[in-house]
């Protein structure tokens, strides 16, 4: 390596206000826990002739680090050890040979809070940019997954529900998806940022909750969304007290309820009363019941909360890392209410059994 042991021209911080050495970076960046952020950064360093052919090494250090003793949090120097707690999560994404010191942080953790400074080394030219420093603020994860239900749900007919975290970023560790549902389910395909649950609803699944929980294990943070399955009974021109389905699987509108009830107003009224009663009981029961499913690898126990009105403690934990890209500012989730999904029952009597067993399905 050329002039490897030449006396450094500039000592770290010795010329903090040196106009020949400058760095441009935002002084503060905010990232939600478990998510990621890319901080643009450029710097300039004058180089004497004897270092012009030397490789440029860049380093990001925590504020207060002693260069000779402490490892950086990120560097492009391959044989350089980095801090264990930031390894693989902090990356010097920019190319220092092109004066780019951009820093990428994925799977942001609470303990990443703090200030960081950049240092360049090129042969015997070495300089720590003590100003400006980058201040990283890690805030609560406010993003929540979205659950997509294509059309209406029909009893006995399978539907693909998709839980997605489109706000997660590609660079992070893919999250763990966990589904919690009383209805018969199986797992469909998953992508980096979405999971498909195949649900085959039954009449008794009316009023039950379906939860998609997403764990960003890289940061030990969990977020979830719960929707409530709203079951609507749709008779098919009844002739007896039992309404078998025709097997066509065709979707009917809510208007079908009215048409089917004209020939038997008494039956319809009674049925409506039963449904309302069942719905009320299930809803009340659901609010009181604590749904708890215990998972393994509870290395970072966190409590994911449903909406403020329907808080149900959940301890679903599984090892995964994050992959979310929040920008510098957190996004506020607008919808904090429970969502209602409609299950249309064609020609089936609602079950009188209101007790519900929940099953948990996980995808990693």
């Amino acid at each position: 390596m050329p002039l490897l042991l030449l006396l450094p021209l500039l000592w770290a911080g010795a010329l903090a206000m040196d106009p020949n050495f400058w760095l441009q970076v935002q002084e503060s960046v905010t990232v939600q826990e478990g998510l990621c952020v890319l901080v643009p950064c450029t710097f300039f360093h004058p180089i004497p002739y004897y270092d012009k052919n030397s490789p440029v090494h860049g380093y990001w250090f925590r504020e207060g680090a002693i260069i000779s003793r402490d490892s950086p949090v990120a560097t492009n120097k391959l044989d350089q050890e980095v801090q264990e707690e930031t390894q693989g999560r902090f990356r010097l994404l920019g190319d220092p040979s092109r004066n780019n010191c951009s820093l990428s942080i994925v799977d942001a953790r609470r303990r990443d809070n703090g200030s960081y400074f950049f240092r360049m080394e090129r042969g015997s030219t070495k300089y720590s940019y003590k100003s400006p420093q980058l201040s990283v603020h890690v805030t609560d994860l406010t993003h929540r997954p979205k659950i997509l239900i294509p059309g209406t749900l029909e009893p006995g007919h399978s539907k693909n529900l998709t839980c997605s975290v489109s706000w997660a970023c590609e660079q992070g560790t893919p999250p763990i998806f966990s589904w919690l549902s009383a209805a018969p389910t199986s797992l469909g395909p998953r992508t980096t940022h979405s999971s498909v649950l195949i649900i085959t609803p039954r009449p008794q699944d009316h009023g039950t909750n379906l939860t998609c929980q997403v764990k960003f294990a890289g940061a030990g943070v969990t977020t979830e969304r719960t929707i409530q399955l709203n079951v609507t009974y749709v008779p098919q021109n009844p002739t007896t007290g039992i309404f078998p389905g025709d097997g066509s699987g065709k979707q009917e509108t809510r208007a079908g309820v009215v048409h089917g009830a004209i020939g038997g107003a008494g039956v319809t009224a009674l049925l409506a009363l039963c449904l309302c009663l069942i719905f009320f009981i299930v809803k009340t029961h659901r609010r009181k019941a604590a749904r708890t499913a215990v998972g393994r690898n509870d290395t970072h126990p966190t409590t994911g909360s449903a909406s403020p009105k329907h808080q149900k403690k959940s301890k679903l934990h599984g090892p995964t890392e994050t992959s979310s890209c929040s920008g510098a500012a957190p996004t506020v989730e607008m919808d904090e209410e429970l969502h209602y999904a409609s299950l249309n029952f064609h020609g089936m009597n609602p079950s009188k059994d209101t007790s519900t067993e929940y099953s948990e399905v996980r995808t990693q």
Epitope: P2, L3, L4, L6, L7, P8, P46, Y49, Y50, K52
Partner: antibody, heavy 116, light 107 residues
Framework: QVQLVQSGGDLAQPGRSLRLSCAAS????????MHWVRQAPGKGLEWVAV????????YYGDSVKGRFTVSRDNPKNTLYLQMNSLRAEDTAIYYC?????????WGQGTLVTVSS | DIQLTQSPSSLSAYVGGRVTITCQAS??????LNWFQQKPGKAPKLLIS???NLEPGVPSRFSGSGSGTDFTFTITNLQPEDIATYYC?????????FGGGTKVEIK
């Protein structure tokens, strides 16, 4: 203490060759880049050549490029300047210089006279 | 090549007086400039590196400043032993180049 002792200066005819030596002592020779600088009588300083600590990179001033060769023998702690195709304008005192951040140590200089 | 224009080429000053020498580079050289002192019959001696850093053992009456293309070398409280020729030299890029020199004499 650091010393750079030069030798090899002489009178040479145009077109002939000379080899200058610079023996280093008092420091770890292979840690340092080394330069040759010259000064024609009554004139200013002119940079001639540089060689990297490991000998891997060498650079020359325009006026000597292709005629002079700088080399070093690290085990012997010695720097060389091979001067071929000498010209009258190469007449000067030649200095070897140690590079440590800046040019902190110079040899005593050796006179090369090119004349017919 | 980077040219260094040094001025004046010679000057005369009183003992205890102040001497200022300028060195202008043909292009920006950041702070990569040395100042040397050469006394008759001797090898040059480095006084200032990096445009303004005084070398160890050099009296504090010598100073340097500047960055980019314009540099200044100053001797305050001129002493008889300061009679010499002073050179600036850039090491921003190869080939390394020197200014033409400034000869300082005592009045």
């Amino acid at each position: 203490q650091v010393q750079l002792v030069q030798s090899g200066g002489d009178l040479a005819q145009p077109g002939r060759s000379l080899r200058l030596s610079c023996a280093a002592s008092g420091f770890t020779f292979d840690d340092y880049a080394m330069h040759w600088v010259r000064q024609a009588p009554g004139k200013g300083l002119e940079w001639v050549a540089v060689i990297w600590p490991d000998g891997g990179q060498k650079y020359y001033g325009d006026s000597v490029k292709g005629r002079f060769t700088v080399s070093r023998d690290n085990p012997k702690n010695t720097l060389y300047l091979q001067m071929n195709s000498l010209r009258a304008e190469d007449t000067a005192i030649y200095y070897c210089v140690r590079h440590f951040n800046a040019w902190d140590y110079w040899g005593q200089g050796t006179l090369v006279t090119v004349s017919s | 090549d980077i040219q260094l224009t040094q001025s004046p080429s010679s000057l005369s000053a009183y003992v205890g007086g102040r001497v200022t020498i300028t060195c202008q580079a043909s292009q920006g050289i950041s702070q990569f400039l040395n100042w040397f002192q050469q006394k008759p019959g001797k090898a040059p001696k480095l006084l200032i590196s990096d445009a303004s850093n005084l070398e160890p053992g050099v009296p504090s009456r010598f100073s340097g400043s500047g960055s980019g293309t314009d540099f200044t070398f100053t001797i305050t409280n001129l002493q008889p032993e300061d009679i010499a020729t002073y050179y600036c030299q850039q090491y921003d890029d190869l080939p390394l180049t020197f200014g033409g020199g400034t000869k300082v004499e005592i009045k």
